[in-house]
């Protein structure tokens, strides 16, 4: 029986060195092992972590947890079914779901979020699901970069 | 040792602004991954329209180098047609370059099954007219 | 190899109570989200609850809301399923079911079963 | 809730033929559909997920097809040991169920 040959050395599926691939290109220049997809760049987990480390592990790469721009912005991966913990946390202090960097959740992007539980995290599935669970559970996560 | 050529840069990301809403390299709505650009398709082909279809697209049928790359696509889509098949069950599975494919394919003893798919971190044999999604590949 | 092995089940008179257990082996049991599944007799199957991989988030059917609470103790690799006020029409082998590793809403494993039957 | 239909409920075949078993959603659920069998007295075994990923294990004479409402379970060629009842669930949300059943039984 064969097995395919590693071709690198680092961890599959772990936020990578920062490695430029396309170096003649004007574009995306994502770190290996990040998909670049309408000018962004997202690293998406193959590992369980809590909300929180996947919240640090994506800021560790200089990048933050998913911020939704619309429900088609995950498309290239629409028929996976599993869930990863995005960058939506709900905020007392602003009675109102909020994404990492202080803007708020449009409630075209999930219709049910008002019967979304406030002490729990949001876990998405690029097919436009969305479901409240415990920040303590360990889901997979997806990082992401903007580039422009 | 590693075979990718790896330049480190702790201080910031190697990210550059971008003219256009695409990546330059790869077609519009194509993703990147690892040096490739990766057409991911949502509509169902035979092998063989999958294959004409990522000709069309200036691109090959999916081809897989390594564990990783089969264990990303397989977070992208459940299956997908892969370029690998053989003439008949006494032949061995060869890539779309006539190369033989020594890699483990499942279900290789049903004479029916002649077209490689992957599937959810394995490859496996199909009936080369059945209708399952297609991905393209073309290497930066 | 996977293994899961459920136990309390009984006879108990409608209104009682009973808890029910599953031994997991053979996997990484704090990994997973885990199931029940019944079965009344002759009947086909039914979902009743899950339980996230940590044992922060559960689910229920409509049917044994507010009477089953589904808990896991992960450093025991065990899954239980406490059912109150139980009803005639909770009779069935209720299975406990382990999460498949693709998504969690297949179910891979399955234990043997254990029958629950309230009657008077 | 998802409800799930199977048809037919019961069907009868020989060893060797080609059997296709069809389940209906109410509401369109992707490719988020799971196929098992269950013979007499045991538990249910996971045979096709997502849709038309076969599990490992089961025999290639068993393959899933289907997307949004309507789906399909078809055995290539029966063998003795398929002689059982067979189920389809949703997986695309909570509650999750399963159709009826459809008992495949020896002609």
């Known amino acids: 029986k064969n097995s395919f040959t590693k071709l690198s050395i680092e961890p599959a599926f772990t936020p990578g060195p920062n490695i430029e691939l396309q170096k003649d290109s004007d574009c995306c220049s994502c770190q290996e092992k990040w998909v670049g997809y309408r000018c962004n760049c997202y690293f998406i987990s193959s590992e369980q972590k809590t909300w929180n480390e996947s919240r640090h592990l994506c800021a560790s790469q200089k990048s933050s947890l998913l911020q939704l721009q619309n429900t088609d912005e995950l498309d290239f991966m629409s028929s996976s079914q599993q869930f990863y913990w995005i960058g939506l946390s709900y905020s007392e202090e602003h009675t109102a779901w909020l994404w990492e960097n202080g803007s708020a959740l449009s409630q075209y992007l999930f219709p049910s979020f008002e019967t979304f539980n406030t002490k729990n995290c949001i876990a998405y599935n690029p097919n436009g699901n969305a479901l409240d669970e415990s920040c303590e559970d360990k889901n997979r996560y997806i990082c992401k970069q903007q580039l422009i | 040792p590693s075979t990718l050529i790896q330049r480190h840069n702790n201080s910031s990301l190697n990210t550059r602004t971008q003219k256009a809403r695409h990546c330059g390299h790869c077609p519009e709505e194509w993703i990147t991954y690892s040096n490739s650009c990766y057409y991911i398709g949502k509509e169902r082909r035979t092998w063989e329209e999958s294959l004409l279809a990522c000709t069309s697209k200036n691109s090959s049928l999916l081809s897989i180098d390594n564990e990783e790359e089969m264990k990303f696509l397989s977070i992208i889509s459940p299956s997908s047609w892969i370029g690998v098949f053989r003439n008949s069950s006494h032949h061995p599975w060869v890539t779309m370059n006539g190369l033989a494919f020594k890699h483990e394919i499942k279900d290789s003893d049903n004479a029916e099954l002649n077209c490689a798919v992957l599937q959810v971190n394995r490859l496996k044999s199909a009936q080369c007219g059945s209708s399952i999604i297609y991905h393209c590949k073309h290497k930066l | 190899e996977v293994q899961l092995v459920e136990s309390g089940g009984g006879l108990v008179q409608p209104g009682g109570s009973l808890r029910l257990s599953c031994a997991a082996s053979g996997f990484t049991f704090s990994s997973y989200a885990m199931n029940w599944v019944r079965q009344a007799p002759g009947k086909g199957l039914e979902w009743v609850s899950t339980i996230s991989n940590s044992g922060g988030t559960t689910y229920y059917a409509d049917s044994v809301k507010g009477r089953f609470t589904i808990s896991r103790d992960n450093s025991k690799d065990t899954l239980y399923l406490q059912m109150n006020s139980l009803r005639a029409e909770d009779t069935a082998v209720y299975y406990c079911?382990?999460?498949?590793?693709?998504?969690?809403?297949?179910?891979?494993?399955w234990g043997q079963g254990t029958l629950v039957t309230v009657s008077s | 809730d998802i409800q799930m239909t199977q048809s037919p409920s019961s069907v009868s075949a020989s060893v060797g033929d080609r059997v296709t078993i069809t389940c209906r959603a109410s509401?369109?659920?992707?490719?988020?559909l799971a196929w098992y069998q269950q013979k007499s007295g045991k538990a249910p075994k996971l045979l096709i997920y997502a849709a038309s990923s076969l599990q490992i294990g089961v025999p290639s004479r068993f393959s899933g097809s289907g997307s949004g409402t309507d789906f399909t379970l078809t055995i290539s060629s029966l063998q003795p040991e398929d002689f059982a009842t067979y189920y389809c669930?949703?997986?695309?949300?909570?509650?999750?169920?399963f159709g009826q059943g459809t008992k495949l039984e020896i002609k």
């Open positions: 669930q949703q997986a695309n949300s909570f509650p999750y169920t």
């Open positions: 079911a382990k999460a498949h590793y693709y998504a969690r809403g297949y179910f891979d494993y």
């Open positions: 509401q369109g659920i992707s490719s988020w």
